[in-house]
Amino acid sequence: AVNGTSQFTCFYNSRANISCVWSQDGALQDTSCQVHAWPDRRRWNQTCELLPVSQASWACNLILGAPDSQKLTTVDIVTLRVLCREGVRWRVMAIQDFKPFENLRLMAPISLQVVHVETHRCNISWEISQASHYFERHLEFEARTLSPGHTWEEAPLLTLKQKQEWICLETLTPDTQYEFQVRVKPLQGEFTTWSPWSQPLAFRTKPAALGKDT
């Protein structure tokens, strides 16, 4: 590989999953690589096989236990190694001391549903998935609504600076099809990032009531 081309980025979902991406320009696509996780204060260790996701990047998920089990805490440090096969031996290509609660990315919110819809308003709720109880209420959300004739990228972001698992969308157009997405982020962690966007929820506002004189 060419010097200065590698990247190794991992995130903890706050419960029992560490997702990693390894990229290396010039590496052969059929190179066999894996990520090995070795916690500093626990008896288990875990390995996952890196699978290609693009021309020069590979990804894998370290499954640490049952989805809702709390496998790591704020004091844990996990040594993560990228090992690639070179001939008959495995060679360490990258290594980092991973602090899980400094590198958080939660799962996308789930169970989006329309609670109530009117002509100009829609109340929507959702749930967070596999989020640690350690956060208590220290979470924030971003939401966006897709209007007809626009793209997701054009949709203005609505910020909820607290753990509020619902929103009331207002100033909507009657009898119009919309889509809605939400994502979540803990307040904790220097390198913490937003979750993926939720699956879009499609809804339609109610038609305006016809006037009595029509």
Epitope: N3, F8, I95, Q96
Partner: nanobody
Framework: EVQLVESGGGLVQPGGSLRLSCAAS????????MSWVRQAPGKGLEWVGG????????IYQDSVEGRFTISRNNAKNTLYLQMNSLRSEDTAVYYC??????????????????RGQGTQVTVSS
């Protein structure tokens, strides 16, 4: 201002041992991977090995694996290089380097942001 000051170099016989130290200041030491590089007389810079920020992981160049050990004391902001079974080809100026992040990459051995002034190691009978 980042400062790295190496010490512990000297003259040693083949097969002997030496321990180098590097005192670091001016940055949050534990947040950065650190490496040792060396330069033999008339030759280019050669990577020796490195250690992650918390000191839990190391990577070595093949020629020193099993003979050299890199460690760190984050409470004292100090990096170490324990060199055993020294050979004449280990003769060089040894430099301590601060890497760009907490992650060490085998294919980025020279991607450091700071380097010390070096300490001379001479292996000779």
């Amino acid at each position: 201002e980042v400062q790295l000051v190496e010490s512990g170099g000297g003259l040693v016989q083949p097969g002997g041992s030496l321990r180098l130290s590097c005192a670091a200041s001016g940055f949050t030491f534990r947040n950065y991977a650190m490496s040792w590089v060396r330069q033999a007389p008339g030759k280019g810079l050669e990577w020796v090995g490195g250690i992650t920020g918390e000191g839990l992981g190391t990577i070595y160049q093949d020629s020193v694996e099993g003979r050299f050990t890199i460690s760190r004391n984050n409470a004292k902001n100090t990096l170490y290089l324990q060199m055993n079974s020294l050979r004449s080809e280990d003769t060089a100026v040894y430099y301590c380097t601060k890497m760009a992040s907490g992650t060490l990459f085998r294919d980025k051995p020279y991607e450091y942001t700071s380097r010390g002034q070096g300490t001379q190691v001479t292996v000779s009978s």
